[in-house]
Interface confidence: low
Amino acid sequence: QLTTESMPFNVAEGKEVLLLVHNLPQQLFGYSWYKGERVDGNRQIVGYAIGTQQATPGPANSGRETIYPNASLLIQNVTQNDTGFYTLQVIKSDLVNEEATGQFHVYPELPKPSISSNNSNPVEDKDAVAFTCEPETQDTTYLWWINNQSLPVSPRLQLSNGNRTLTLLSVTRNDTGPYECEIQNPVSANRSDPVTLNVTYGPDTPTISPSDTYYRPGANLSLSCYAASNPPAQYSWLINGTFQQSTQELFIPNITVNNSGSYTCHANNSVTGCNRTTVKTIIVTELSPVVAKPQIKASKTTVTGDKDSVNLTCSTNDTGISIRWFFKNQSLPSSERMKLSQGNTTLSINPVKREDAGTYWCEVFNPISKNQSDPIMLNVNYNALPQENGLSPG
């Protein structure tokens, strides 16, 4: 059976298409091509006489068509108006005519799309943004990409207008993009340049660094404040509620105890109109802000009950500190047998009893800091009881 095939079926505007013929009968006088689904003389494109190998253009000939001896028809520089059906009529030598109809579709070579936006400087958690992919073209699929990924499933993302419009509901700072739209048809695809959103947000609660609270007199105090914000926050500093300066960094050289107090960083975003503050307490003191971990030692860790005594010593290199002792989470001394000496650095137990067995540790502290030693275990043994009546125990 006579058939035709379009190569390709989907044609890019300006390209060419070949209407191939299959199963062409052997004995032919000629054949004609027509535009449409039926034979219509007014819409004949070309006729071909096999005997003379002569091609004759018809009323629907545009000058872009070429017919070949095998009946195939080449149409060059196609336009969208060429889309549709084409009918081949074969005039056989037995005067029985055969017909076959084929079709193809011409699509435009898509231009590079662009993204228009109703708001390129939205405010976080407040504004919605609608992106529209331009231009609007027929038979076109619209796709969107965020950060080079296809759209995630999100209730904040809505597609409309045949996917040509992407709406972001209640934008966040993470919605900066980039955003790209892609237009596709069966013959071409083109992606827009990326568009980024300048999401106005913040300021978030500022962070004051460094995190240190304690400083020694004579040191330099350098505090830096940062709050996530777009546009970047404007900063100001207050000390004990009194305005100092409008900078991101506060520097006070050679501090004294009088510089102790409440340091407030104020961050302001003039676009969002929002302000945030963070307060940091600074203490200027001679005392060591970090007391080193003390070491605990025992004269012996295994003793005989009611017989031995033991000395526990708490060692530290820090000055201006106090020492306290703990046994099983209880503060010591807890009995008359326990004595503290040498500024509480030594705990003496004399004599040791069964109930003194367990974990001991010491703690060194000053008004602003403290630290504990590792625990030490005291084991208390008793000599075996003498056997009574010559009987074996048990």
Partner: antibody, heavy 121, light 111 residues
Framework: EVQLLESGGGLVQPGGSLRLSCAAS????????MSWVRQAPGKGLEWVSV????????YYADSVKGRLTISRDNSKNTLYLQMNSLRAEDTAVYYC??????????????WGQGTLVTVSS | QSVLTQPPSASGTPGQRVTISCSGS????????VSWYQQLPGTAPKLLIY???KRPSGVPDRFSGSKSGTSASLAISGLRSEDEADYYC???????????FGGGTKLTVLG
């Protein structure tokens, strides 16, 4: 199209003076902080000075403080650098550059083609 | 001696990925945005990256910036011969109250 065009460079003797200009076009000049950046022959970039969009805030590199003065005339869309007490180490190509962030996140998105200042006796 | 430290040179072959580092301190990179500039021979510098990692329009996505702590880096993927240039990092310095640049890295595209 944003354009920055420096002029006023040339040969000057040590101790002498020179005034550089930078004519801006293609953008609203008064909305942008502007800087001068220099580059000695065969060397890297060295920031010289910045002036805020309204001219109220000015900063200088330590190496030029007291000798170089930055200014701007927003009505003429022009940035200036008055250079006094010039030294041999001031020899460089001087670029004017635009900061689109008003100094909040300083960066230079457009640069002029530069003008050469040579300090030599 | 530059406030920001960059390697003086870097190299790679076409198609390779190269990274240029920029080291500073808490007064500049640690608390401020970093920018990267490309300077082709005989031309003015051109902005490649601003605000640590943002690309101006027109800059290929082969160029990317990142920052961690007091160090920043510029990565160039799919290296091309036209990438041969000097690359500078820059940031505002809170201590100096001024903008500081790295000493620059000369990138050579081999082969």
């Amino acid at each position: 199209e944003v354009q920055l065009l420096e002029s006023g460079g040339g040969l000057v003797q040590p101790g002498g003076s020179l005034r550089l200009s930078c004519a801006a076009s293609g953008f609203t000049f008064s909305n942008y902080a502007m800087s001068w950046v220099r580059q000695a022959p065969g060397k890297g970039l060295e920031w010289v000075s910045v002036i805020s969009h309204g001219g109220g805030s000015i900063y200088y590199a330590d190496s030029v403080k007291g000798r170089l003065t930055i200014s701007r005339d927003n009505s003429k869309n022009t940035l200036y650098l008055q250079m006094n007490s010039l030294r041999a180490e001031d020899t460089a190509v001087y670029y004017c550059a635009r900061d689109p962030t008003k100094g909040y996140a300083p960066t230079f998105d457009y640069w002029g083609q530069g003008t050469l200042v040579t300090v030599s006796s | 001696q530059s406030v920001l430290t960059q390697p003086p040179s870097a190299s790679g072959t076409p198609g390779q990925r190269v990274t240029i580092s920029c080291s500073g301190s808490s007064s500049n990179i640690g608390n401020n945005y970093v920018s990267w500039y490309q300077q082709l021979p005989g031309t003015a510098p051109k902005l490649l990256i601003y605000a640590d990692s943002k690309r101006p329009s027109g800059v290929p996505d082969r160029f990317s910036g990142s920052k961690s702590g007091t160090s920043a880096s510029l990565a160039i993927s799919g290296l091309r011969s036209e990438d041969e240039a000097d690359y500078y990092c820059g940031a505002w310095d809170l201590s100096l109250n001024g903008y500081v640049f790295g000493g620059g890295t000369k990138l050579t595209v081999l082969g």
